[in-house]
């Protein structure tokens, strides 16, 4: 978590700042959503527990050609300690449940806000 905050970041970003920035990006997505997000693409639902940043990235990375979530994908990769590529799945996916990207983002946003409120940044 030392180099989060985008390519223009002048130096290490505190974990609380990185989480706040991710939350702000998800808020932007939900606010600016006019047409169905990512054309209504479906992604695997995840368990919002430990390791969920990687699981979230593994779900969202399978959505291609959706510029609205590209920044989110980059930010999530900063929270995930290993490299994630399309087609990769962790045990945190609820493999029998697919949801729209918009609902996925909404659920993730609420959970991250709770983590921020509780001071759990990593």
């Amino acid at each position: 978590l030392t180099c989060l905050g985008g390519f223009a970041s002048p130096g290490p970003v505190p974990p609380s700042t990185a989480l706040r920035e991710l939350i702000e990006e998800l808020v932007n997505i939900t606010q600016n959503q006019k047409a169905p997000l990512c054309n209504g693409s479906m992604v695997w639902s995840i368990n919002l527990t430990a390791g969920m940043y990687c699981a979230a990235l593994e779900s969202l990375i399978n959505v291609s050609g959706c510029s609205a979530i590209e920044k989110t994908q980059r930010m999530l990769s900063g929270f995930c300690p290993h490299k994630v590529s399309a087609g990769q799945f962790s045990s945190l996916h609820v493999r029998d449940t697919k949801i729209e990207v918009a609902q996925f983002v909404k659920d993730l946003l609420l959970h991250l806000k709770k983590l921020f409120r509780e001071g759990q940044f990593n």
Epitope: L110, K113, F116
Partner: antibody
Amino acid sequence: QVQLVQSGAEVKKPGSSVKVSCKASGFYIKDTYMHWVRQAPGQGLEWMGTIDPANGNTKYVPKFQGRVTITADESTSTAYMELSSLRSEDTAVYYCARSIYDDYHADDYYAMDYWGQGTLVTVSS
Amino acid sequence: DIQMTQSPSSLSASVGDRVTITCRSSQNIVHINGNTYLEWYQQKPGKAPKLLIYKISDRFSGVPSRFSGSGSGTDFTLTISSLQPEDFATYYCFQGSHVPWTFGQGTKLEIK
């Protein structure tokens, strides 16, 4: 509209337990924290604890630890507070309250914005 | 536990008066995330409390602009700029930054 409706008044014997319910409507309880606060007759407010109904995580005041259990049932949108080993000093009005977030602000923790009507629990032999 | 001490414990004032209630915490209540979860509640006899102010100075929706909050660190203030008849009640400060979260003992605002 948002409402928190609590169960009715209770009279209990010392040493027994009481379970107070708080039924939510107008919002999803998984999007909130649900809190319990009590107020002894003529006294101030005392926060007892909270639950995140999305995962069941709880926080309690140490003085109640082991005697209080806060639970939530997402399917019925109801939060519960059970207090055991009751003593006369537990006579109080017990309130539930929620804290919620909205989707449109990055930092929007709204504190205890809606409260139940209160449940009077009287502990008497 | 963090103690929240309000002063005064009771206060007599008249309609139109400017009233200030202070709340002091026994230690700094800045949360690890940088926010300060200091809140003010109003309670009338036989009724549930109502949220007035959250995060020191954010007014909750529907709360009249005559209510304002300020402060930082350990010292906080609730100000009512011009008392109205419906403002006579008991006011509580509350910190939600460090578990266990705690209320002040209350300030009873009475009609002079």
